[in-house]
């Protein structure tokens, strides 16, 4: 058992491209850092992995498809988020968000367990960011990016908890 | 509404250094991010640089490792340093700020101009 970190969240929906400047920025503290993630403030677009039948991010050929900066082709900073679960293990999710360069990993929790969060475990996988959020904020955000809309999340560094009991999966 | 002030352009011979300065004011959200793109004589504009929610810097290949962007957030202001400049380099040069995210079209300045001479 260790001690937890909360994370702050600061997350805005938009409609891209529309040309409507409105904006909702909506601050919680819905988090949890992973007890191997660096404890760091990371800001980006939230990007699910492609496919229909890849949200657990367990095949190691799991993609995902980046937005870019205006009127260019560079990459802006973005956020993997995956769901719990699918049969690997926490470090294999983030380790893989790393590899295809997120600058962090959300990873949400399994459907009923509504706002749960636990704390990961994931030795080996400590180069990006990775906090868990709640199923019922996850799906919030995976069904707003099915619809098109562009969901950017800020992280910021909460408060000190624990201990809790780890999990690696 | 945003308004952008860019400053700091020039002639310069092959080799040397600028640094360009843009100062927003008006509507600006917390989580703005600015930036420059170019337009050459001819050209379309291009992306050069930006840095988004003061955290994350994206550079144009053509440019990396001798353009450095950053921001003074305290005075809404973006800095483009631009160092070992090649006569390629000469355009006008435009700020461009978002009050979303730097995906979405941007706010443009009216530009400064920017001549490399070999």
């Known amino acids: 058992a260790e001690a937890v970190w909360t994370a702050y969240l600061n997350v805005s929906w938009r409609v891209p491209h529309t040309g409507v400047n409105r904006t909702v920025w909506e601050l919680s503290e819905e988090g949890v850092y992973g007890q191997d993630s660096p404890l760091e403030p990371v800001a980006g677009v939230l990007v699910p992995p492609d496919g229909p039948g890849a949200l657990n991010a367990c095949n190691p050929h799991t993609n995902f498809t980046v937005p870019t900066v205006w009127g260019s082709t560079v990459q802006v900073s973005w956020l993997a988020l995956i769901q719990r679960g699918g049969g690997c293990t926490f470090a294999d999710k983030i380790h893989l968000a790393y590899e295809r360069g997120a600058s962090g990993a959300v990873i949400f929790n399994f459907p009923g367990t509504r706002n749960e969060v636990i704390p990961m475990s994931h030795p080996g996988a400590v180069d990006i960011v990775a906090i868990m959020i709640g199923n019922l904020k996850g799906t919030k955000i995976l069904q707003s990016i099915q619809r098109g809309i562009q969901v950017t999340m800020v992280i910021e560094v909460g408060k000190k908890h624990g201990p809790w009991v780890n999990h690696y999966s | 509404q945003v308004q952008l002030q860019e400053s700091g352009g020039g002639l310069v011979q092959a080799g040397g250094s600028l640094r360009l300065s843009c100062a927003a004011s008006?509507?600006?959200?917390?989580?703005?991010?600015m930036g420059w793109y170019r337009q050459a004589p001819g050209k379309e504009r291009e992306f050069v640089a930006a840095i988004d929610l003061g955290t994350s810097t994206y550079y144009a290949d053509s440019v990396k490792g001798r353009f450095t962007i950053s921001r003074d957030n305290a005075k809404n202001t973006v800095y483009l340093q631009m160092n070992s400049l090649k006569p390629e380099d000469t355009a006008v040069y435009y700020c461009?700020?978002?009050?979303?995210?730097?995906?979405?079209?941007?706010?443009w300045g009216q530009g400064t101009q920017v001549t490399v001479s070999s």
């Open positions: 008006g509507t600006i959200s917390y989580y703005y991010a």
């Open positions: 461009a700020a978002w009050s979303d995210y730097v995906t979405e079209l941007p706010y």
